[in-house]
Amino acid sequence: GITIPRNPGCPNSEDKNFPRTVMVNLNIHNRNTNTNPKRSSDYYNRSTSPWNLHRNEDPERYPSVIWEAKCRHLGCINADGNVDYHMNSVPIQQEILVLRREPPHCPNSFRLEKILVSVGCTCVTPIVHHVA
Amino acid sequence: GITIPRNPGCPNSEDKNFPRTVMVNLNIHNRNTNTNPKRSSDYYNRSTSPWNLHRNEDPERYPSVIWEAKCRHLGCINADGNVDYHMNSVPIQQEILVLRREPPHCPNSFRLEKILVSVGCTCVTPIVHHVA
């Protein structure tokens, strides 16, 4: 990896023992300066593999609300608005980091956690299994 | 929101002043017990709106490596393998939380940051602009 010289102004609280505990400022900086006009706003409805968004709430997690996509159909929507079963609607999944309160119910002590979320759906050609 | 009784065993380091600083254990707990076999592994190639994955690396960020999807085509791939320009390949974007080293180059001091990432692509019907 890349070695970065340590800033002499860093808080002096490093612990060599794992689990490693660090200080995190929860005042979120929003870097979403993405100017791409193609934002995901209504794609869930206009997609050939449309999806519904389900609210997943957990007060012990930060962020407490995560939206999960569930594909509406097994197949994909064709030009006539019908479901084509020779194609598959599948969820696009991503691993994201969240903060889990640890010990539970503590307002200022967390553990990093990786969770898998479905962000949306895409239409794929199925894998055909040939029988010998 | 939901009020949670505070655990008496919590570390006593709460600061009422924003920016709020918390302790985070970086020993990641992986909750990916998802048994769904439809993982996003090869969807980027099999999708009717295929995408390429570009590595975005930043040693000042945790995680330092994030993969960004870029749709391969303006339109979507049809059954003949040609591009259908009457459909659009669009990126599915998601806001995720990352940790940004703050002050820079500090190994144990971070600030939460929201960034927008493109996770994959989906095929959508275009918005038709009707001329009066």
Epitope: - | W51, N52, K70, C71, R72, H73, L74, G75, N78, N82, V83, D84, Y85, H86, S89, V131
Partner: antibody, heavy 110, light 107 residues
Framework: EVQLVESGGGLVQPGGSLRLSCAAS????????ISWVRQAPGKGLEWVGS????????YYADSVKGRFTISADTSKNTAYLQMNSLRAEDTAVYYC???GQRYAMDVWGQ | DIQMTQSPSSLSASVGDRVTITCRAS??????LAWYQQKPGKAPKLLIY???SRASGVPSRFSGSGSGTDFTLTISSLQPEDFATYYC?????????FGQGTKVEIK
Amino acid sequence: EVQLVESGGGLVQPGGSLRLSCAASGFSFTSYEISWVRQAPGKGLEWVGSIYLWGGSTYYADSVKGRFTISADTSKNTAYLQMNSLRAEDTAVYYCARFGQRYAMDVWGQ
Amino acid sequence: DIQMTQSPSSLSASVGDRVTITCRASQSISSYLAWYQQKPGKAPKLLIYGASSRASGVPSRFSGSGSGTDFTLTISSLQPEDFATYYCQQYYSSPLTFGQGTKVEIK
């Protein structure tokens, strides 16, 4: 002003090579395909190929597949058409054009 | 590939005439059809996109119609600067294909 400027044409022997350039200005280069269209003397328009600048995908007419290569340098806002193994029937005026899904080929080189 | 057939291949007309050029696609292309005008020694110029929408700066005497497989370009009152060759193009799917062109000449 939105414009495309081609360069690099010339006289070449059969079997030879030539590279054409298409410099774009005045628009977001990555939101479109850049298409190459040719016109043989006294004939109609023929699509040669395209490049989707954002995704990097390239497309070719069967008549040039394997001989012509389209590429782009997004830092220079320039697309290229590399023509190898040239034949007499490739003799034509070559145009580059901006292609979008809504307006088709709305901007052409000179 | 989608074939585009234009007719007529050439026509003679006078200033002030109403001129109609037709274009037929080998399969349905919805409204993904464009019309271009080309004058000798010049690059083509977009006239109509989406079968019926006029491109910026195109005079109102030019109009397009049709959907599916049959399309028409109409010049309501031919002007001296309209003598040129006109091409239709489908952009429904790749490969992009053009009609063979219609040359409008002075009678």
